[in-house]
């Protein structure tokens, strides 16, 4: 008799999930010498242990602590780039400005980026059919809890000037319900972080509005100021040109020396 399986509203675990995590871990540790000491099999065992045989709506940050410990990584705390709803551009930026780090440039973020996973209560099986949706099913699911945990730790580690890339094409440029708005903003440490600098990325070619005056940006400024952190905001009107100039600042159309 086939066992009854809970049907969740979200997509199931990414196919070849164990192999993908292990392969990503090996690749990352090979090209990042400071992480060469990491044993990828142990990382996978700790990752698996966080959600296998557990109810996928009852996952806690505690479940991920063994993985967090194995994936402990020091990044330059003054070179952190947070992002919200504009992941691709943030990643393109840290590819051309390699001294800056998004969460996905760290081992744990790299392992889980764009993947979905969940298990089932009391069985060692991975559920490839469906996983809980954050809105429709439950918020304490394996994926959401993972990102909440690593995002909190990443924000807590930040110092000096912290940068955040925001999507100026969205109706809510700053969204209180995003990971940035609900987790990272509240875990920046005022005793370490001097300024949060928002980069608002424009979508339209002819868009010359000052999106730093947007009500949601003012809301972000208010939240940050109340936490005794300074706030600054800059418009990036042409993201394509911006990336090009970051790569080659000596181009005559780009230069502004300090």
């Amino acid at each position: 008799v086939p066992r009854w399986r809970q049907q969740w509203s979200g997509p199931g675990t990414t196919k070849r999930f164990p192999e993908t995590v292990l392969a990503r871990c090996v690749k990352y540790t090979e090209i990042h010498p400071e992480m060469r000491h990491v044993d990828c099999q142990s990382v996978w065992d700790a990752f698996k242990g966080a959600f296998i045989s557990k109810h996928p709506c009852n996952i806690t940050e505690e479940d991920y602590q063994p993985l967090m410990k194995l994936g402990t990584q020091t990044v330059p705390c003054n070179k952190i780039l947070l992002w919200s709803r504009i992941k691709d551009l943030a990643h393109q930026f840290t590819q051309v400005q390699r001294d800056m780090f998004t969460l996905e440039d760290t081992l744990l973020g790299y392992l889980a980026d764009d993947l979905t996973w969940c298990g089932e209560f009391n069985t060692s099986k991975i559920n490839y059919q469906s996983c809980p949706d954050w809105r429709k099913d439950c918020s304490n699911n394996p994926v959401s809890v993972f990102w909440k945990t690593v995002s909190r730790r990443f924000a807590e580690a930040a110092c000096d000037v912290v940068h955040v890339m925001l999507n100026g094409s969205r109706s809510k440029i700053f969204d209180k319900n995003s990971t940035f708005g609900s987790v990272e903003v509240h875990n920046l440490q005022p005793e370490k972080v001097q300024t949060l600098e928002a980069w608002v990325i424009h979508g339209g070619r002819e868009d010359s509005r000052d999106l730093c005056q947007d009500p949601t940006i003012k809301e972000l400024e208010s939240i940050i100021s109340k936490r005794n952190i300074q706030f600054s905001c800059k418009n990036i009107y042409r993201p394509d040109k911006f990336l090009q100039c970051v790569k080659n600042p000596e181009d005559s159309s780009c230069t502004s020396e300090i």
Epitope: E34, R98, R238, P249, C254
Partner: antibody, heavy 127, light 108 residues
Framework: EVQLLESGGGLVQPGGSLRLSCTGF????????MSWVRQAPGKGLEWVAD????????YYADSVKGRFTISRDNSANTLYVQMNSLRAEDTAVYYC????????????????????WGQGTTVTVSS | QSVLTQTPSVSGTPGQRVTISCSGI??????VSWYQQLPGTAPKLLIF???QRLSGVPDRFSGSGSGTSASLAISGLQSEDEADYYC???????????FGGGTKLTVL
């Protein structure tokens, strides 16, 4: 013209002290991270120390840690290095250098290079 | 603190192309820069961010990098290129500058 001018070098006995100065011209000194680099006679370049634009972060080579102090006076556009407990192996030409930074569409970025160098000042430690 | 490794000397005739290598870069996120030091003068920046030429530097000078090594190529060698060349990298994890030992270029 962007320029750095060092001064303060000279002959000093082992165990003695010396303070070198470097004044910047032609750029916004307050915005610039600065470094000291030295070159012993007939040898290669050796980094000595680095300081952030407002002086709140300082970094040192192991060989000078605890003996040298890098500092700056932004109101005078001047960088300093205070050298104490000097040794014969500190004999070198000392250069100050500006860290390369650029503003790309109002965003300030560090390019991890030294784009302006002073002419150097000679320090000789000998009895 | 580690030192980057450079070939101590290279030579070439006018018009030739020479390459200077730099190895021992600890991390793929560290950028390499290249400096020219003419006899009796201060160093001068040629290349930053692995392969970006500083404005005013002739395009005969080019930099390249792949992971843990980098190189400086000089094509169409000229007598005035005779100098010492240094690679350097700022280690973003340790907050230290690391220099190569230098390469003496002789134009025969």
């Amino acid at each position: 013209e962007v320029q750095l001018l060092e001064s303060g070098g000279g002959l000093v006995q082992p165990g003695g002290s010396l303070r070198l100065s470097c004044t910047g011209f032609g750029f916004t000194f307050t915005d610039a991270r600065m470094s000291w680099v030295r070159q012993a006679p007939g040898k290669g370049l050796e980094w000595v120390a680095d300081i952030s634009s407002y002086g709140d972060n300082t970094y040192y080579a192991d060989s000078v840690k605890g003996r040298f102090t890098i500092s700056r006076d932004n109101s005078a556009n001047t960088l300093y290095v205070q050298m104490n407990s000097l040794r014969a192996e500190d004999t070198a030409v000392y250069y100050c250098a500006k860290r390369m930074e650029r503003e790309v569409m109002t965003i300030k970025l560090d390019y991890h290079a030294m784009d302006v160098w002073g002419q150097g000042t000679t320090v000789t430690v000998s009895s | 603190q580690s030192v980057l490794t450079q070939t101590p000397s290279v030579s070439g005739t006018p018009g030739q192309r020479v390459t200077i290598s730099c190895s021992g870069i600890f991390n793929i996120r560290n950028y390499v820069s290249w400096y020219q030091q003419l006899p009796g003068t201060a160093p001068k920046l040629l290349i930053f961010k692995d392969d970006q030429r500083l404005s005013g530097v002739p395009d005969r000078f080019s930099g390249s990098g792949s992971g843990t090594s980098a190189s400086l190529a000089i094509s169409g060698l000229q007598s005035e290129d005779e100098a010492d060349y240094y690679c350097a990298a700022w280690d973003i994890f340790l907050n230290v500058w690391v220099f190569g030992g230098g390469t003496k270029l002789t134009v025969l």
